[in-house]
């Protein structure tokens, strides 16, 4: 589903001819200097380049742009807006560019935008008009189908005074621009929790990545609206236990895959209702995998076969029987 | 090769049953939805049934009770179970993978004839 | 029951010729956009060319484009070429809470004149 370069027969322009043809106007579907282009697979390629700018005479055929492994810092609004537009361009990839910076309006007049991947580039300043282009209420509706922001994180050091998780919900909801989105992917990204009104507002999803983070819970999260989610990744966070609110909501979904391994599960008391779901639920792929991280003496047993008897919780004692 | 490939077509009596096959290569079938589409001869294409991901099923409103979609995702195999076939269901059956983002047919296999007739 | 209505049935058309298609619902397509058209030859199983209404598939030649919201779409060929006589199908995805539904039109037959 995602376009891919099956290009052959790539033509380059020789860097050392840019700075003889850059007094004059571009020619029309010439390839940008440190690029490599093919107009049968209406692909242009700017990868590991160094480049600090978005070239400015991309051949206005493009329906795949790549301008990975560059020196970007800065997407400023209007960074891909041409004159004719590029009315082609459906799938850009920006990853491992070195982008901080991504301004309001920085995807505007690209019409045809399906697939944006930001991914691996530490993201401190992600403006919240980034998608919608306006900071009107509700903006024009956003192309995007797939969006993929993994490992977009910045350096603790060089994160604003604010929490990176709303950042990145702002952008996601400004406008209700993202209404069509189908591909979400947000792996990697440190989040401690998920926003409560994100995902209500992204009612298309069919993939959502929340892999190797350090969700806690989602106790706060509801999956209601999200008819259409068909896999939820959720491996390698800090999940302790799925409460029946999330387990009844899951079930719900009539499509829904869920991938849960890799998180520190709590077998005690509160982890009886789950221990059950499991034990019923077609929902969840790889779940004879999931195992008890804690209390100790119920480490690396496999949920699956755990019992109510086996789920216990210490009694908790009276402030005046406790020891320090 | 990414592929998939129709079989079980053959001749039937009319009120008789037949399994069709579709066998897929170079991808997991329990990725994606798959669907079956026919067409008579010289007439136009015409959907049948779907299943999803995690197995809900959903059918035209003619096929609904008499047509069966289902898979096998250790053999990597669809199938379609066809109950009290009728002379009008005489068609080339196709097998078709749906987008895993978008809800189109991505990818055909070849069709298998089935040929209800006395 | 979901229509979907092409026109025209059939055609004409030289070699370098503007040809458009147009295919109603009688729905709106899911998220107004999921609307997919196909060519197909004899003997051949279709091809998808256009999917999300306007999204040129893998290897499709871009002389082929698609336009729509809802219920009207488009698809143009914008100078045809020898390869392009075939029949040419739109087909529509609709949802509902009783789930989903796909349909094709009833295709339109591209003949050289």
């Known amino acids: 589903s995602s376009p891919t370069s099956s290009a052959s027969s790539f033509s380059s322009s020789a860097p050392f001819l840019a700075s003889a043809v850059s007094a004059q106007p571009p020619l029309p579907d010439q390839c940008p200097a440190l690029c490599e282009c093919s107009e049968a697979a209406r692909t242009v390629k700017c990868v590991n380049r160094n480049l600090t700018e978005v070239p400015t005479d991309l051949p206005a055929y493009v329906r795949n742009l790549f301008l990975t492994g560059n020196q970007l810092a800065v997407l400023p609004a209007g960074a891909f807006a041409r004159r004719p537009p590029l009315a082609e361009l459906a799938a850009l990839n920006l990853s491992g560019s070195r982008l901080d910076e991504v301004r309001a309006g920085a995807f505007e007049h690209l019409p045809s935008l399906r697939q944006l991947d930001l991914s691996h580039n530490p993201l401190a300043d992600l403006s919240p008009f980034a998608f919608s282009g306006s900071n009107a209420s509700v903006s024009a509706p956003s192309p995007l189908v797939e969006l993929i922001l993994n490992h977009i994180v910045p350096p603790e050091d060089e994160r604003q005074n604010r929490s990176f998780e709303g950042m990145v919900v702002a952008a996601l909801l400004a406008g209700r621009a993202l209404q069509g989105l189908r591909r979400l992917e947000l792996a990697s990204n440190h989040f401690l929790y998920l926003p409560r009104d994100v995902l209500a507002q992204l009612p298309s999803l069919r993939h959502l990545d929340l892999s190797n983070n350090s969700l806690v819970s989602l106790t706060y999260v509801s999956f209601r609206n999200l008819t259409h989610l068909e896999s939820l990744h959720l491996e390698d966070n800090a999940l302790k236990v799925l409460h029946n609110g999330t387990l009844a909501e899951l079930q719900g979904l009539p499509h829904i895959r869920v991938f849960l391994d890799n998180n520190p599960w709590v077998c005690d008391c509160h982890m009886a209702d789950m221990v059950t779901w499991l034990k019923e639920t077609e929902v969840v792929q790889g779940k004879d995998r999931l195992t008890c991280a804690y209390p100790e003496k119920m480490r690396n047993r496999v949920l699956l076969e755990l019992n109510s008897a086996d789920l216990d919780c210490d009694p908790i004692l009276p402030p005046s029987l406790q020891t320090s | 090769e990414v592929q998939l490939l129709e079989s079980g077509g053959s001749l039937v009596l009319p009120g008789g049953s037949l399994r069709l096959s579709c066998a897929a290569s170079g991808f997991s079938l329990s990725s994606y939805w798959m669907s079956w589409v026919r067409q008579a001869c010289g007439k136009g294409l015409e959907w049948v049934s779907i299943i999803a991901g995690r197995g809900s099923t959903y059918y035209a409103s003619w096929a609904k009770g008499r047509f069966t979609i289902s898979r096998d995702n250790s053999k990597n195999t669809l199938y379609m179970q066809m109950n009290s076939l009728r002379a009008e269901d005489t068609a080339l059956y196709f097998c078709a993978r749906v987008s895993s983002i978008y809800y189109t047919f991505n990818l055909w296999g070849q069709g298998t004839l089935v040929t209800v007739s006395s | 029951e979901i229509v979907l209505t092409q026109s025209p049935s059939s055609l004409s058309a030289s070699v370098g010729d503007r040809v458009t298609i147009t295919c109603q619902s009688s729905q709106s397509v899911y998220s107004n956009n999921e609307l997919s058209w196909y060519q197909q030859k004899p003997g051949k199983a279709p091809k998808l060319l256009i999917y999300y209404a306007s999204t040129l598939a893998s290897g499709v030649p871009s002389r082929f484009s698609g336009s729509g919201s809802g219920t009207d779409f488009t698809l143009t060929i914008s100078s045809l070429q020898p390869e392009d006589f075939a029949t040419y199908y739109c087909?529509?995805?609709?949802?509902?809470?009783?789930?989903?539904?796909?349909?094709f039109g009833q295709g339109t037959k591209l003949e050289i004149k």
């Open positions: 087909q529509g995805s609709y949802y509902s809470g009783s789930g989903w539904y796909y349909a």
